[in-house]
């Protein structure tokens, strides 16, 4: 089957990108004696970039897009796992379609797993966006979690906090939010496993369990929060730290009395 090995040079990047249905342009047209106003790069269709985790069966094609604009026309380059990505880094190479700000990889294999970052830049600025690729078996597989989620948070005392965990799983996953806690001054139980508190778990609909919201947080709620996802094949977990800061002395409100509510203990592997 055809498998191009060199990046395709479709066209130079164009700010009048046909990838967008939007005809509007923030650029001023160049006249004989005036230069267009410089514009740092910006995303022209950020809503098309919201899906960051792409779990794709082997042999399929992956297309990542970073539709952009700017003046002068920005350049586009791609990194894999933070390093320069060259066509000879993968069997079959890849194609960069500059006119549509996209990279295309055909016939993906497990070694294509990783983070792919587009960098769009001109002399007035640089923007970047990272996609996560996982190459999966179509048959049931362990859960996969989007990298970087949940994210660490630092908030003021009394604030509300939202942690998010993006899950890709077939079969249906069970999602738990856990917090590492101390019992009688100890973080580890007699069985050598950490003490954890179950804050939330999925019922029939797991999508709402992907978000953990904490209201009116206290200093006692600082610590490590874990998103643990399991199905009958296996499990995955990722954690984030919550830091609750007190305002400066003169700004301090009345003492807040929100006792930590301990649902129950759970030994967590």
């Amino acid at each position: 089957r055809p498998s191009p090995t060199l990046p395709e040079q479709d066209a130079l990047p164009s700010s009048e990108d046909d990838d967008d249905d939007d005809d509007s342009s923030s650029e001023e047209k160049e006249t004989d004696n005036t230069k267009p106003n410089p514009v740092a790069p910006y995303w022209t269709s950020p809503e098309k970039m919201e899906k960051k985790l792409h779990a794709v069966p082997a042999a399929k094609t992956v297309k990542f897009k970073c539709p952009s604009s700017g003046t002068p026309n920005p350049t586009l380059r791609w990194l894999k796992n933070g390093k320069e990505f060259k066509p000879d880094h993968r069997i079959g190479g890849y194609k960069v379609r500059y006119a549509t700000w996209s990279i295309i990889m055909d016939s993906v294999v497990p070694s294509d797993k990783g983070n792919y970052t587009c960098i769009v830049e001109n002399e007035y600025g640089s923007i970047n966006h990272t996609y996560q690729l996982d190459v999966v078996e179509r048959s049931p597989h362990r859960p996969i979690l989007q990298a970087g989620l949940p994210a660490n948070k630092t908030v003021a005392l009394g604030s509300n906090v939202e942690f998010m965990c993006k899950v890709y799983s077939d079969p249906q996953p069970h999602i738990q939010w856990l917090k590492h806690i101390e019992v009688n001054g100890s973080k580890i139980g007699p069985d050598n496993l950490p003490y954890v508190q179950i804050l939330k778990h999925s019922g029939i609909n797991s999508s709402d369990a992907e978000v953990l919201t904490l209201f009116n947080v206290t200093e006692a709620q600082s610590g490590e929060y874990v998103c643990k996802v399991s199905n009958y094949i296996g499990e995955a977990n990722q954690s984030a730290w919550l830091t609750v800061t007190r305002p400066a002395l003169e700004e301090r409100p009345a003492v807040m009395t929100s006792p930590l509510y301990l649902e129950h203990h759970h030994h967590h592997h």
Partner: antibody, heavy 116, light 108 residues
């Protein structure tokens, strides 16, 4: 150059099971490809039925999923289709094909008629 | 599930340019492939990955894909181009392959 050849009965009775096999030559069924079945009722368009990877991983058209089974026999370099509880609406030319994201090799197709 | 919409028929005079469209929700994010099928024959891939041509396919066949529409363009149409043309994607959301309904190209 990979070649695909469908084989199986051209006539199946209603409520029976349609069984077809696709022999792959000139290439290995263990390559990084999906092995697919596509059908085309007389005078109508192409309909994807389903596919299998050499590991046994499968994917099926949701409208046919309850009646379809696709299997692979690596030792014979072939894959098979079974479609149960057939009706006259399943009368079609059945193609086997090799695919990545697209179909780059096809069998010549075999007409299967469902009739008593 | 994902739906691809094609016009049932397109007519063009020899030597002119034929454009066959394939509509789908945000299809520009998918890779679109095109097949030519002549009566009594199996389909033949003419464009893959939106705009690439397999070896042996004339340069007259080209493709584009953006927004909600992919287009197969056949320039300098010949009588031998008369056939049914199908677009196809692998829908990454549902993990299924989908064909458009097909377009009959008639060369006048």
């Amino acid at each position: 150059q990979v070649q695909l050849q469908e084989s199986g009965p051209g006539l199946v009775k209603p409520s029976g099971t349609l069984s077809l096999t696709c022999a792959v030559s000139g290439g290995s069924i263990s390559s990084n490809n999906w092995w697919s079945w596509v059908r085309q009722p007389p005078g109508k368009g192409l309909e994807w039925i389903g596919e299998i990877y050499h590991s046994g991983s499968t994917s099926y058209n949701p409208s046919l999923k309850s009646r379809v089974t696709i299997s692979v026999d690596k030792s014979k370099n072939q894959f098979s289709l079974k479609l149960s509880s057939v009706t006259a609406a399943d009368t079609a030319v059945y193609y086997c094909a090799r695919a990545t994201d697209w179909f780059d090799a096809w069998g010549q197709g075999t007409l299967v008629t469902v009739s008593s | 599930s994902y739906v691809l919409t094609q016009p049932p028929s397109v007519s063009v005079a020899p030597g002119q340019t034929a454009r066959i469209t394939c509509g789908g929700n945000n299809i520009g994010s998918e890779s679109v492939h095109w097949y030519q099928q002549k009566p009594g024959q199996a389909p033949v891939l003419v464009v893959y990955d939106d705009s690439d041509r397999p070896s042996g396919i004339p340069e007259r066949f080209s493709g584009s894909n953006s927004g909600n529409t992919a287009t197969l363009t056949i320039s300098r149409v010949e009588a031998g181009d008369e056939a049914d043309y199908y677009c196809q994607v692998w829908d990454s959301t549902s993990d299924h392959r989908v064909f458009g309904g097909g377009t009959k190209l008639t060369v006048l």
